[in-house]
């Protein structure tokens, strides 16, 4: 059987000879060299060599336990002649003994940590960790103790855990933000002769809201022209806050003053400035100076710092309204006038009024914008703003005239205003009614008396207030002895009726009927229209079959016997 125990070897051997490990020996070995000892496994033939005759093992190189603490090898004892093993192949261990040859090494060369300013003493900041590659199971070579080399009295470190805590009350970021702390880790439980390593911890105090906003001045003055439209920025005010980030965010508001309704303040999120803007239209002539009380406050407040006072500040803002030479202002935004279409030239329609709103009350002259009245139908009295016609009107041509009137300051022609004028032309009965279309109809030869052969419609260009009322009749010259009659339907239509039984197209092929159409307005207007009636052969259903191609026309425009 094999005769050995576990082999132990001290690491980092510095002798000049190979380091002796131990002896492999089989009780079958007679000492005559008949056995051959063979080593295999971790480092065999390289780190570890064996005397194949004696079984003595030596280490050829300096070994480092931290690199490899245990080597597992296999031993064979073989009969040199036959190759026959005299023992079963066996595994054995070479264990490397530790020496304190490694200093503690921090997991980071530099740690960065943050802790809120004004933290209570003992507030956790960060935990640093150092590891020692030496054997933790043997001696104190890997027992690490932490201490602080730099960073007192602000911070402390727990010797066992490496936890860094705050050690000073009321550390103020606004006073000092950055701290560099140096921590030492020492092995051998911190005893003399222990190896040590250090790390740097860069600690930043993070901001808390422990400072209110402050205006650098108590009063601000801005000027703005009275013409500034709503939304116009007038000026910027800025309160400073020693804090940073959201703790330094400021909201501005107007809390008091006679300009409370006239101005707004908005917060510029980028610059943290308050922008004073116009809220309503200003009028120098009404009020020349406004005062506002503007407040700057932190939107996020930490209750534990309220004892330091309110987290807001206020300032007075004085706004001076500057006079602006303003254009004339019309009494209305638009004017609507009306005039009869039969008005004579120079008839006055109405008038416009404009005034200079400035204190100077400069006189104004009026004119028509000729781009809006190319035909020069209207004119204006430049002095008093009276509008009058300069040409005759026709409602039936144009119902509405849309023109623009200009008011200009006489002393400063650059200051002018414009106003729209809508002129409605009122109707006058100046058009006669007419047939709605050209009427040409036919009558069957075998037609019976009082038979309706055509319905007549009329149109009138006028637009009477109470609507059209037309009357129809045969012209006086055709009324007696006519072959047809006109029946007025009293609904603005009329019918042509036969007056006899039967017509002979060979005797009279065409009749021309003069019809008088009158309206019922003042003054009455009438016109005469002619209806052509052809005599045709029809079937028994009354459908036309044939007519003469042309009518015999009487020189007076009436057929004989119509």
């Amino acid at each position: 059987s094999w005769m050995w125990n576990q082999f132990f070897l001290l690491e980092e051997y510095t002798g000049s000879d190979y380091q002796y490990v131990g002896k492999l020996h089989s009780d079958q070995d007679r000492g005559d060299g008949s056995l051959k000892y063979i080593l295999s496994g971790d480092g065999a033939g390289d780190l570890f060599i064996i005397n194949e005759n004696t079984g003595d093992i030596q280490a050829t190189k300096r070994l480092d336990r931290e690199e490899k603490p245990v080597y597992i090898l296999r031993a064979q004892a073989i009969n040199r002649r036959t190759g026959r093993p005299v023992e079963p192949e066996s595994e054995f261990i070479i264990k490397i003994h530790d020496i304190n040859d490694n200093e503690p090494i921090f997991t980071k060369e530099v740690y960065t940590a943050t802790v809120p300013e004004m933290s209570d003493v003992g507030t956790f900041v960060v935990q640093v960790t150092a590891t020692d590659a030496d054997d933790p199971t043997y001696g104190n070579s890997a027992k690490v103790v932490y201490s602080i080399l730099q960073g007192q009295p602000y911070f402390s470190v727990e010797s066992e855990t490496g936890i860094i805590k705050t050690a000073l009350l009321n550390m103020d970021r606004e006073n000092r933000e950055q701290y560099q702390v140096v921590i030492q880790a020492k092995d051998m439980g911190g005893q003399m002769g222990g190896l040590s390593g250090t790390t740097t911890v860069n600690i930043t105090l993070t901001d808390v809201n422990d400072n209110p906003p402050r205006f650098p001045q108590s009063t601000y003055q801005f000027k703005t022209p009275e013409s500034s439209p709503p939304g116009t920025p007038i000026g910027r005010i800025k309160a400073s806050d020693a804090d940073v980030g959201e703790n330094a965010e400021i909201e501005y508001s107007i809390t008091d003053g006679e300009g409370l309704d006239m101005f707004d303040v908005i917060t510029d999120q980028e610059t943290q400035e308050g922008i004073i803007t116009v809220k309503k239209l200003l009028d120098f002539e009404k009020k020349k100076v406004y005062t506002l009380k503007v407040e700057a406050s932190n939107p996020y407040v930490e209750p534990r710092f309220l004892y330091l006072g309110p987290f807001k500040d206020s300032a007075t803002v004085r706004i001076v309204v500057e006079d602006v030479d303003e254009p004339p202002v019309f009494s209305k935004l638009a004017y609507i006038l009306q005039i009869r279409e039969d008005a004579q030239i120079n008839t006055t329609i109405g008038s416009v009024t404009a005034q200079d709103p400035d204190a100077a009350r400069n006189p104004v002259k009026y004119s028509v914008d000729r781009h809006t009245d190319m035909d020069r139908i209207f004119n204006i009295d430049s002095g008093n703003g009276s509008i009058f016609t300069s040409k005759l009107l026709d409602r039936e041509t144009l119902l509405w005239h849309n023109i623009t009137v200009i008011a200009t300051e006489i002393n400063n022609p650059k200051q002018s205003s414009r106003v729209p004028l809508y002129i409605k032309v009122l109707d006058v009965n100046d058009n006669a009614p007419e047939f709605a279309e050209f009427y040409e109809t036919f009558v069957c030869e075998k037609a019976k008396a009082d038979q309706l052969i055509q319905t007549l419609h009329a149109v009138d260009k006028d637009d009477p207030y109470s609507g059209h009322q037309f009357s129809f009749s045969l012209a006086p010259e055709a009324a007696s002895g006519s072959n047809f009659t006109i029946q007025d339907n009293k609904d603005n239509t009329a019918g042509i009726l036969t007056r006899k039984n039967g017509y002979n197209r060979h005797e009279m092929s065409t009749y021309l009927l003069p019809v008088v159409i009158s309206d019922n307005d003042y003054p009455v207007q009438s016109s005469t229209g002619t209806v052509t009636v052809r005599v045709c052969a029809c079937d028994h259903h009354g459908n036309m079959q044939s007519c003469h191609a042309e009518a015999l026309i009487h020189p007076t425009g009436l057929s004989t016997g119509a």
């Epitope: 036959t82 190759g83 026959r84």
Partner: antibody, heavy 117, light 111 residues
Amino acid sequence: EVQLVQSGAEVKKPGSSVKVSCKASGYTFTNYWMHWVRQAPGQGLEWMGDIDPSHSETHYTQKFKDRVTITVDKSTSTAYMELSSLRSEDTAVYYCARGDLGRFDYWGQGTTVTVSS
Amino acid sequence: DIVMTQSPDSLAVSLGERATINCRASESVSIHGTHLMHWYQQKPGQPPKLLIYAASNLESGVPDRFSGSGSETDFTLTISSLQAEDVAVYYCQQSFEDPWTFGGGTKVEIK
């Protein structure tokens, strides 16, 4: 390089003896056993015996125990195999071979011994 | 004596094909996980050459198409892809017990 050089061919009469030499070079002669193997014409290999050069310890196969003698001369790193009472069936090629853990890792070129009347 | 029986006596294999030679010992030649069985190649007019030792270990300088396996009494020599230069007689040998004995040999030829 390891070399085993054997003596030349021999023609012998039946009943006589033959001594074949094997000169070793390229390694420590006393660290390895030396074996002798023969091969009759057209036949297989037959192990005859071996010797430990450091102690002159020998092993012979039963078949040749009374007729074979294996010796060494450590000074010349030479091994010898002497076979006596030769018979026609001893006609063969005789090889020396270095032994290492039961295997023959180097062989001589062989010596032909012919036994004929 | 331990008798070594090789099979087959001869073997014809195409170039590039696998050749397998078996060797059976009359009793076990294994002890403590070591198999005292070795394989040799002999070409005409030349001494034998060691190919495989201790059943499966390839001798230095031998192509890796040769491999050995087995334990106790049954062992195999395999040529994974036969080459022209592999034409030879192959012998197995045991060193487990005196006298050391060889198999009768297997002649490998090209088909």
